[in-house]
Interface confidence: low
């Protein structure tokens, strides 16, 4: 395995090494003494949800009782690289991304839960674990072989203002309908209580006399 | 559900052999690491010898190296101890547990054999099997 990381060391000076010149306190101070490579383990392939949401677990073996751990996300395609999102924690506490980060996760233990939010098809790609434990020294550095992560982008609805047309449509036809029916059953209604009557009127004399005036019956005589 | 189950101890005079047996079901072998731990009365329990079982990496105690050899059966599951020259000072309940190889350095020297021989690492135990070492 290639060495992913470097042992930090610091110098620990007596009277006899404080004579020494500068550059080599220089070296001892920066130059990696040991390497150690820190394995990183993560899922080959996730599919996200249609919603856009991939979710993995990044696990790492820790070699010692790291206190401060920070996870990086990176995206590889092709032979390009780009960071999606960072976290530094503190072992027991929650992983804390930027606000305008797509990232959200919660650690435990060796095993941090990555969550990647507003995925398109797009954003199809490997995407590597990077974990390093920052404190206390010494610093290691492992990364995960990555994960593949699939992003179908769901079917375009139809249009809403065309489904608002056929809605209006419908309810339309329907109080129309319900009008037309009203007023029919109300027509029926009424013609059933009115009398039936010709349209023919002929005048008849009244029951009782009134003002003692009399009406003779007369006769059209018709040729 | 993980089970490891040991198996072979006894009583055997100093100078004689034994061998463990370690039976694992509930997961494979793959990928894992499994440890084997003894325990005396009133001391703590100490890291005997260690095989990862994808590489077949081991591990061993420095009490123990030239005397104890770890081994591993694929098809049957099984990790090995065999243990010869044996010493009264060898007498303890012997465990066998198991860790996944993620939890473990990946990479051995440097310091990184102590995480496979500390019991804190692993995270299955079986229920141990009794050893004494006595004439």
């Known amino acids: 395995m290639a060495c992913l990381g470097f042992q930090r060391h610091k110098a620990q000076l007596n009277l006899a090494t404080r004579t020494w010149p500068c550059t080599l306190l220089f070296f001892l101070l920066f130059i990696p003494v040991f390497c150690k490579a820190m394995h990183v383990a993560q899922p080959a392939v996730v599919l996200a949800s249609s919603r856009g949401i991939a979710s993995f677990v990044c696990e790492y073996a820790s070699p010692g009782k790291a206190t401060e751990v920070r996870v990086t996300v990176l995206r590889q395609a092709d032979s390009q690289v780009t960071e999606v999102c960072a976290a530094t924690y503190m072992m027991g506490n929650e992983l804390t991304f930027l606000d305008d980060s797509i990232c959200t996760g919660t650690s435990s233990g060796n095993q941090v839960n990555l969550t990647i939010q507003g995925l398109r098809a797009m954003d199809t790609g490997l995407y590597i674990c990077k974990v390093e434990l920052m404190y206390p020294p010494p610093y290691y550095l492992g990364i995960g072989n990555g994960t593949q992560i699939y992003v179908i982008d769901p079917e375009p609805c139809p249009d809403s203002d065309f489904l608002l047309w056929i809605l209006a449509a419908v309810s339309s036809g329907l109080f129309f309908y319900s009008f037309l029916l009203t007023a029919v059953s109300l027509s029926k209604m009424l013609k059933k209580r009115s009398p039936l009557t010709t349209g023919v009127y002929v005048k008849m004399p009244p029951t009782e006399p009134e003002c003692e005036k009399q009406f003779q019956p007369y006769f059209i005589p018709i040729n | 559900e993980v089970q490891l189950v040991e198996s072979g101890g006894g009583l055997v005079q100093p100078g004689g052999s034994l061998r463990l047996s370690c039976a694992a079901s509930?997961?494979?072998?793959?990928?894992?690491?499994i440890g084997w731990f003894r325990q005396a009365p009133g001391k703590e329990r100490e890291g005997v010898s260690c095989?990862?079982?994808?590489?077949?990496?081991?591990y061993y105690a420095d009490s123990v190296k030239g005397r104890f050899t770890i081994a591993r059966d694929y098809a049957k599951n099984t990790v090995y101890l065999q243990m010869n020259s044996l010493k009264p000072e060898d007498t303890a309940v012997y465990y066998c547990?198991?860790?996944?190889?993620?939890?473990?350095?990946?990479?051995?020297?440097?310091?990184?054999?102590?995480?496979?021989?500390?019991?804190?690492?692993?995270?299955?135990w079986g229920q141990g099997t009794q050893v004494t070492v006595s004439s």
């Open positions: 547990a198991a860790v996944h190889g993620l939890k473990l350095p990946s990479q051995r020297g440097l310091g990184g054999s102590y995480y496979y021989l500390l019991a804190r690492s692993y995270d299955y």
């Open positions: 509930g997961f494979t072998l793959d990928y894992y690491a």
């Open positions: 095989i990862t079982i994808s590489d077949g990496d081991t």
